[in-house]
């Protein structure tokens, strides 16, 4: 019967122990336990390599250790003279002795305590897929954001599902496209669109790469559309197999996607549209709408491009364009954002030359860089001047967004040699 | 500098102190500069310093110390056994890359390189600067930087002079076309410690610069005619050496 | 040879201010643009503030915006960091860095620690 | 704002082997403005490498570095002990924050 702790005492002990003994302890503590095995007094016959009398400490086929002589305790606030840490939950103590002790040998007093073991760390092989995590008696698997954990209880998915589309044009992606999808996973994505809207799903063929079929043809990790009763697919392998433009008659439409443990590819990514409160047509200084129509509906896209200098700063990522909706409440999406004018930003440091600095380090501002004069000169022209271009960076009419060069001046002496008459 | 003046670190912002040997250079860019292969042959590893007039102990300290990285010897500079006997000083050239740019001001600034038109060969009579702190007419080594002007003469001026204490045969000297002899007018020359050290001609195109046409290379006596190594003939092989061993910074 | 010397840290308390100083040499101050670079006790690097070099412009990171300001004087090549209303999240050590091509940080000062706490 | 990724978080190798570490960004960096730094504990960092491939003065031909668009690397192509520090990807884009990676450290294996 499995103990938590327990005592191991030589034969007779206190006293002298008889000779020609042999004794064995089997420990044994609950499973998920390790054993902390500590010796608070040795006093056994010395003999070279413990041949004589001798404690034995065999874990499996392994000895641990083999015990003789005298000891005491290193440390004053300790009672411990020997121990041992093993991470299986059985040990076995073997105390032996021969037919003569030349002097009274008192033998041995150990003690052994459950400990626990970290089956995350203490093990060649790793039990969980992902996060291992250990606790008192035994361990248990997680799995990073975005993944859950399989009935096994070792092995991570991720949980991919639940995503809703109702925009009208839209694109839909694998999980880390273009990196390799996840594995073991099931993702749903499920477009709605208001009724009267068919949806159309677009693929371009170098847009899809999915684990291929097996030699029975059947796809190990699959790609699968549903509308209503009818289903397209499942689809896998090397460059879409399917048709390019998948017409569903449905304003609702399911994509599942299915991946096994092995094999993961780089995934796909699709296009989709739906096919037909007017918005106003806004006023957005130093841009141009995309398309440009006399009257907008509800569901109009339209792409509002920033005239050149302008940037719309979004996330604090610098974009020369973006698209607005025609809401169903008359008013259009993203009215916050507007085309400024772009931040060329400081102006980069030369070596052995400046840059004053400009009024202004927007679009249009003008900044010059010389040289260290008179001891370095600009070697790679363009006159130093430079302005803020369009696209962001300070450029020169010659030299483009290169910096100058400032370079030594070779051959001219700060004072001419005079020969002084003798 | 035999027969030279006084001079100041400002006539001459290209010349570098080499303290083991005592010896010159000249700086021709933020990374290199040029010597005499014969100074360089048995320490590849110099100590060198620009910027300063006196090469007084106290005065280098104040002065910039510039740190080698590698140095390149003309490949056809003849190696020996025992340099002290030499008598072949063809190809008597070296470039040393330095660890770090040196930064220029006004006693600090390199010489040009000769072009390589026809307008860089030089004739007898032009004259060019010398300056060192070589041997002088009363000491050993000049504390203070000294220089002189001298004319180019012909080659044969320079085989016509008997060489002071020779280590062969006088018909054992070389002379190539790789050499440059000058001197000869009222005793100036270069001497023993100003070796690698630059002979700065006006530049025919630019009045304002110099260029080194020569490099002090070796002579058969003090105070006669010296032999100059003729920069013109190397103009390809130190911008394919500087090319080669450049960083992204330099390019 | 280029030096950078930070100077100014300590120990503040939490709405308290200090100001940081740099001290440069061994280079054209004027010439080059500057910032301010910290890094809290075991944690990586987060820039703080640039300026240009001739002083006119200044960016910051938005969590210091309002609170820090970052200032030069050529004259004395000097830079500066002035914070207030700090918050125990700006404790760390505060480098300052010259900016080369390309923005890259070329030298760093050995850096000044300011700690706030109550 | 650009966010850079740098990968593994920290690195266990031997002197001799090779090293290559990752720097990603969540938005494509100019390669002239992408830079790495080195650390060493209780010291400042120095510049390494500068726009994308250039070695900082002084720094061992040894070290290299790649990348373009979102994807940058640091590679040692035989780790001596004085390279085992840690090491940041920098980027400088227009608009702020400028951005440090979270780093990657070296470490004695």
């Known amino acids: 019967e499995p103990t938590m702790y327990g005592e191991i005492l030589s034969p007779n002990y206190p006293q002298a122990y008889p000779s020609e003994v042999e004794k064995s302890w089997d420990i044994e503590v609950p499973e998920g336990y390790g054993i902390h095995l500590y010796f608070t007094h040795l006093d056994i016959e010395l003999s070279e390599n413990c041949a004589y009398d001798s404690v034995q400490i065999i874990s499996g086929d392994t000895e641990e250790g083999r015990l003789c002589g005298q000891r005491s305790s290193n440390n004053p606030h300790s009672p411990i003279v020997e121990e041992f840490q093993v991470p299986y939950n059985k040990l076995q103590v073997i105390f032996k002795s021969d037919f003569s002790n030349e002097e009274r040998f008192t033998g041995f007093a150990a003690y052994y305590v459950a400990t626990d073991i970290n089956e995350c760390t203490d093990f060649v092989d790793v039990p969980c897929s992902h996060f291992c995590n250990n606790f008192i008696g035994g361990y248990f698997c997680s799995c990073p954001p975005e993944y859950f954990l399989h009935d096994d209880m070792k092995n991570c998915g991720v949980n991919c599902s639940g995503d809703v589309f109702t925009a009208l044009i839209g694109e839909i992606a694998s999980p880390n496209y273009p990196k390799p999808y996840p594995e073991n996973s099931r993702c749903e994505y499920q477009i709605r669109l208001e009724k009267g809207f068919q949806v159309v799903v677009t693929l371009r063929r170098e847009d899809f790469d999915v684990e291929a079929a097996d030699s029975a043809g059947n796809c190990l990790d699959s790609l699968v559309f549903v509308a209503g009763d009818r289903q397209f697919g499942p689809y896998c392998g090397h460059g879409f197999p399917g048709p390019l433009n998948i017409e569903t008659k449905s304003n609702a439409l399911d994509i599942i996607f299915q991946t096994d443990l092995t094999g993961q590819k780089k995934g796909w990514k699709l296009r989709y549209h739906g096919d037909p409160m007017p918005c106003p047509k806004e006023d957005t200084p130093n841009s141009v709408w995309e398309p440009a129509k006399a009257k907008y509906v509800f569901r109009d896209v339209v792409q509002i491009t920033c005239l050149d200098g302008f940037e719309v700063v979004e996330g604090r990522v610098g974009a020369t364009s973006f698209y607005s909706t025609c809401q169903s409440n008359g008013k259009w999406s993203n009215s916050k954002l507007k085309c400024q004018p772009v931040d060329c930003g400081i102006p980069e440091s030369i070596e052995n030359g400046k840059v004053e600095d400009p009024e202004s380090t927007l679009f249009g501002s003008v900044i010059r860089y010389t040289c260290e004069e008179p001891y370095y000169y600009m070697e790679n022209g363009g006159g130093g001047e430079y302005h803020c271009a369009g696209n962001g960076s300070w450029v020169n009419e010659v030299l483009g967004p290169e910096l100058p060069k400032c370079v030594p001046v070779c051959g001219v002496p700060r004072e001419p040699f005079e020969e002084k008459q003798r | 500098i035999i027969g030279g003046s006084d001079a100041d670190i400002k006539n001459f912002p290209w010349q570098v102190f080499f303290d083991n040997p005592w010896a010159g250079g000249a700086l021709i860019n933020e990374y290199w500069v040029l010597t005499a292969a014969h100074v360089v042959e048995g320490n590849r590893e110099p100590t060198m310093y620009v910027g300063s007039t006196s090469v007084q102990t106290s005065r280098l300290a104040k002065s910039k110390m510039l740190t080698p990285e590698h140095v390149f010897i003309h490949p056809g500079w003849k190696l020996l056994e025992v340099p002290e006997g030499r008598t072949n000083f063809d190809n008597d050239i070296a470039l040393v890359r330095l660890k770090d740019p040196v930064k220029m001001g006004p006693t600090v600034s390199p010489i040009c390189l000769p072009g390589t038109s026809s307008d860089y060969n030089l004739m007898d009579g032009d004259l060019g600067l010398i300056s060192g702190w070589g041997r002088t007419e009363k000491r050993d080594r000049a504390v203070r930087l000294k220089a002189a002007r001298l004319p180019v003469a012909p080659l044969r001026k320079c085989k016509e002079v008997k060489v002071e204490k020779p280590t062969a045969d006088a018909e054992a000297y070389v002379f190539t076309p790789n050499m440059i002899c000058a001197g000869g007018e009222k005793g100036m020359d270069s001497c023993k410690g100003d070796s690698g050290g630059a002979f700065a001609v006006q530049d025919p195109n630019d009045k304002t610069k110099f260029y080194a046409a020569g490099l002090v290379s070796w002579g058969p006596q003090c105070g006669t005619y010296g032999l100059y190594t003729r920069v013109k003939n190397y103009v390809d092989w130190i911008m394919k050496t500087m090319q080669e061993n450049s960083t992204p910074r330099e390019d | 040879e280029v030096m950078l010397v930070e100077s100014g840290g300590g120990l503040v308390k939490p709405g308290g201010s200090l100001r940081l100083s740099c001290a440069a040499s061994?280079?054209?101050?004027?010439?080059?643009?500057m910032s301010w670079v910290r890094q809290a006790p075991g944690k990586g690097l987060e820039w703080v503030a640039t300026i240009s070099s001739g002083g006119s412009h200044t960016y910051y990171l938005d969590s210091v915006k309002g609170r820090f300001t970052i200032s030069r004087d050529n004259s004395k090549d000097t830079l500066y960091l002035q914070m207030n209303s700090l918050r125990a999240e700006d404790t760390a050590l505060y480098y300052c860095?010259?900016?080369?091509?390309?923005?890259?940080?070329?030298?760093w000062g050995q850096g000044t620690l300011v700690t706030v706490s109550s | 704002q650009i966010v850079l990724t740098q990968s593994p978080a920290t690195l266990s190798l031997s002197p001799g082997e090779r090293a290559t570490l990752s720097c990603t960004a969540s938005?494509?960096?100019?390669?002239?403005?992408l830079h790495w730094y080195q650390q060493k504990p209780g010291k400042a960092p120095k510049l390494w490498i500068y726009s994308t491939s250039n070695l900082a003065s002084g720094v061992p031909s040894r070290f290299s570095g790649s990348g373009s668009g979102t994807d940058y690397t640091l590679t040692i192509s035989s780790l001596q002990p004085e390279d085992f520090a840690t090491y940041y990807c920098?980027?400088?884009?227009?608009?702020?924050?400028?951005?440090f990676g979270q780093g990657t450290k070296l470490e004695i294996k």
């Open positions: 938005s494509s960096v100019s390669s002239s403005y």
């Open positions: 920098h980027q400088y884009y227009r608009l702020p924050p400028i951005t």
């Open positions: 061994g280079f054209t101050f004027s010439n080059y643009a």
């Open positions: 860095a010259r900016l080369f091509t390309g923005h890259a940080m070329d030298y």
